[in-house]
Amino acid sequence: HTAAQDNCTCPTNKMTVCSPDGPGGRCQCRALGSGMAVDCSTLTSKCLLLKARMSAPKNARTLVRPSEHALVDNDGLYDPDCDPEGRFKARQCNQTSVCWCVNSVGVRRTDKGDLSLRCDELVRTHHILIDLRHRPTAGAFNHSDLDAELRRLFRERYRLHPKFVAAVHYEQPTIQIELRQNTSQKAAGDVDIGDAAYYFERDIKGESLFQGRGGLDLRVRGEPLQVERTLIYYLDEIPPKFSMKRLTHHHHHHHHHH
């Protein structure tokens, strides 16, 4: 768990406290909330970031239509239970013993139950659709330029392997970024698409998680790309298990950014 050794900080996670008391006398950065040591050479897991956040003093259809099994994060923030590696535990419970199952990005994928609820495994979210609406501009962005810039962003800022950015769709003013990563495709050391999507979401909101870096300044051929609305859909390797009542009254949670 190394970090910038000269001043012992965590470039990839400002929600940490760092001290020179790690193995071998190296700098060790602990995530707020959990106290788990994080690897500052890569993104911190979404579970640890959420825990830290909760502990902090607070026409030609080129666009993808999410499938009926797509999940959106309707429940908002909660203080999650993370496993020893910092991943979401399959079962989450609140203080009043209400429990539910989540996927690998921490989004609820079952109806809520009691302490007897079983979540046998952590189901992987293998497809993430990031749906953005940009502010009006003089003209539409060039699709290939936009595609290249967003791919560069995920590769350089979030260290996500290019093969996991499946597609970038554009139909002014809507941009869609598709991230795909099956269990079999994810090798040791690969950034998880769920973590990359969460860092991107926080960047878009002007809440960058990176230490000391300026906020996200997205430009396409010098033209600022300003996002006014994001909506993220999560698709799991195994479809979610909601009651029919829930499926027929599925309220999408929209993130508005101004």
């Epitope: 001290s19 020179p20 008391d21 020893p84």
Partner: antibody, heavy 115, light 107 residues
Framework: QVQLVQSGAEVKKPGASVKVSCKAS????????IHWVRQAPGQGLEWIGT????????VYNQKFRDRATMTRDRSISTAYIELSRLRSDDTAVYYC????????WGQGTTVTVSS | EIVLTQSPATLSLSPGERATLSCRAS??????IHWFQQKPGGAPRLLIK???ESISGIPSRFSGSGSGTDFTLTISSLEPEDFAVYYC?????????FGQGTKLEIK
């Protein structure tokens, strides 16, 4: 050389509060966690919590969250723990220790709670 | 919270013998375990950090091993001053916890 020197023994009545100090020297006080640990007579070691002196970020063992307060004064390289609403079972030796692996310890402060 | 279980509770050996003390964690904690010796009336003293890293000033007869959930402190040849209580402690995540201790006594 690194040293942690604690304040002297205290005798308190139930319901009172006690504040123990831990003065650090021989290293950069702000860069290492200070932990508080207690040991009741004949018992094992119990972690109360920790504070990071640089920014005063503190973490408490759930058991002590409502009664313990950890603070620090960077100007005199001293950490403090205050325990309120004392009970007889708070009678113990209270230690401060440095870093995640507790490489240096204070000499201990005996707190006796008795009516 | 992570529970550390030490065994045996008491270990009776003679000077010159080899002592093997065990500490088991309730979940995977990597190598975030540290070992302490405590004598009556004194503060604990760090012997080993991060499962196997030696500490300056600690005799080489003290060594540590293990990772994940099972950890061992070994004293290769007991000296009379080694008879004391030994604790393991983890620093994987908050709250930090200690094992209940192993008392090493003279047989």
């Amino acid at each position: 050389q690194v040293q942690l020197v604690q304040s002297g023994a205290e005798v308190k009545k139930p319901g009172a509060s006690v504040k123990v100090s831990c003065k650090a020297s021989g290293y950069s006080f702000t860069t290492h966690w200070i932990h508080w640990v207690r040991q009741a007579p004949g018992q094992g070691l119990e972690w109360i919590g920790t504070i990071f002196p640089s920014n005063a970020y503190a973490v408490y063992n759930q058991k002590f969250r409502d009664r313990a307060t950890m603070t620090r004064d960077r100007s005199i390289s001293t950490a403090y723990i205050e325990l309120s609403r004392l009970r007889s079972d708070d009678t113990a030796v209270y230690y401060c220790a440095r870093a995640s692996y507790f490489d240096y310890w204070g000499q201990g402060t005996t707190v006796t709670v008795s009516s | 919270e992570i529970v550390l279980t030490q065994s045996p509770a008491t270990l009776s050996l003679s000077p010159g013998e080899r002592a093997t003390l065990s500490c088991r964690a309730s979940q995977n904690i990597g190598t975030s375990i540290h070992w302490f010796q405590q004598k009556p009336g004194g503060a604990p003293r760090l012997l080993i950090k991060y499962a196997s890293e030696s500490i300056s000033g600690i005799p080489s007869r003290f060594s540590g091993s293990g990772s994940g959930t099972d950890f061992t402190l070994t004293i290769s040849s007991l000296e009379p001053e080694d008879f004391a209580v030994y604790y393991c402690q983890h620093s994987h995540s908050w709250p930090f916890t200690f094992g209940q201790g192993t008392k090493l006594e003279i047989k």
